[in-house]
């Protein structure tokens, strides 16, 4: 008898089964149909809760969740100060917008990353066209 | 409407024999295996056998070898004969489909694995 | 012959909640595992096959993951619609050239 499987019907390194009466496809993950021809989509139906946004990867999806939420569809409230947001000692504030970050003396930016200097100048990164350093970043 | 209705069941005495039948409608019976799958009062669903319509294949559970027969009928129906019948027996029998796929230029028919039709189910109780 | 468990066998849970139900099958099965629901009185209904592709009109808060071995099916925003027994399967291919299919013993679930 030919041996069906030796043409390699299976996609995606499925493997082949001849059944005898059919052949049978066991896919790898992340791929299905009757030859593993589908590549799944892993974020298809897959909502994430509150603003967070599916990731694909590895045949499961995971969800990036908003600031403040967590667990695997983002319907968990989390802390957002839990991380430690803020650089050099500043202060985390929980904030329903997010968090706020009141920075240590000597200290400045949005999460307290930039050094003050102490002629009054900050040491931002240059800002893009249209944007002062000192103005809140976006 | 797709649909699979089974009949012939009801109460039967040890020792006896029974044919149940299933009778499809609503979708073309070839590139599917139908199959009849048991289930005991509060217990899960058992395989016993499948027969696949192209070319009239059958194939059942090793433990459903030499009572449980199933045959092709006609070109919208199977049935499932049972032979030496036990109380072991009683359960509500199940007709399913299992769909198979065929492609333009491929070697054979692939299965699916899975049941994505199912009938309500015909009760047998084996009782004297 | 491949061996399908379920676990747990029962499980409770509130409207709004999530349930995760496990089936470990006894090879390796690849992504070849489907997820049916039943109601009493009811044959059981095909939720999603190849571990994750849900049936058409099954709504999204069904969610099967899993590969190989060890698979899921997760059910969240419970509703007292999902209170049914649910039963993985899958097929197997032995050596000795027969081929067949095998159910989890299921689990049940109760929406309170």
């Known amino acids: 008898r030919v041996d069906r499987c030796s043409l390699q019907p299976c996609r995606n390194g499925g493997l082949c089964l001849d059944l005898g009466h059919a052949l049978r496809c066991r896919c790898r993950a992340g791929f299905a149909g009757p030859r593993c021809e589908h590549d799944l989509d892993d974020c298809a139906g897959r909502a994430c809760a509150n603003g967070g946004t599916c990731v694909e990867g590895g045949g499961a999806h995971r969800c990036s969740c908003a600031l403040g939420f967590g667990g695997r569809d983002c319907r968990e409230r989390a802390d957002p100060c839990a991380a430690r947001p803020c650089a050099h000692g500043g202060r985390c504030y929980a904030h329903f917008s997010g968090l706020v970050c009141a920075c240590a003396p000597g200290y400045m930016g949005a999460r307290c990353e930039f050094p003050v200097h102490p002629d009054g100048a900050s040491a931002l990164p240059a800002a893009p066209p249209g944007l002062r350093p000192g103005d809140p970043q976006r | 409407q797709e649909q699979l209705v089974e009949s012939g069941g009801g109460l039967v005495q040890p020792g006896a024999s029974l044919t149940l039948t299933c009778k499809a409608s609503?979708?073309?019976?070839?590139?599917?295996?139908m199959c009849w799958v048991r289930q005991a009062p509060g217990k899960g669903p058992e395989w016993i056998a499948c027969?696949?319509?192209?070319?009239?294949?059958a194939y059942s559970a090793s433990w459903a070898k030499g009572r449980f027969t199933v045959s092709k009928t006609s070109s919208t129906a199977v049935t499932l004969q049972v032979t030496g019948l036990t109380a072991a027996d009683t359960a509500t029998y199940f007709c399913?489909?299992?769909?198979?796929?065929?492609?333009?230029?491929?070697?054979?028919?692939?299965?699916?694995?899975?049941?994505?039709?199912w009938g309500p189910g015909t009760l047998v109780t084996v009782s004297s | 012959d491949i061996v399908m468990t379920q676990t747990p066998a029962s499980v409770e849970a509130a409207v709004g909640g999530t349930v995760t139900i496990k089936c470990q099958a006894s090879?390796?099965?690849?992504?070849?595992l489907a997820w049916y629901q039943q109601k009493p009185g009811q044959p059981p209904k095909l939720l999603m096959h190849d571990a994750s592709v849900l049936t058409s009109g099954v709504p999204s808060r069904f969610s099967g993951s899993g590969y190989g071995t060890e698979f899921t099916l997760t059910i969240s925003d419970l509703e007292c619609a999902d209170a049914a027994t649910y039963y993985c399967?899958?097929?197997?291919?032995?050596?000795?050239?027969?081929?067949?299919?095998?159910f989890g013993g299921g689990t049940e679930v109760v929406v309170k």
């Open positions: 090879e390796n099965i690849y992504n070849s």
């Open positions: 609503g979708f073309d019976f070839t590139s599917n295996a």
């Open positions: 027969i696949y319509n192209d070319d009239g294949s």
């Open positions: 399913a489909r299992s769909p198979y796929y065929t492609y333009g230029g491929a070697p054979s028919a692939y299965a699916s694995g899975y049941f994505n039709l």
């Open positions: 399967q899958s097929d197997y291919y032995s050596t000795g050239g027969s081929y067949g299919f095998a």
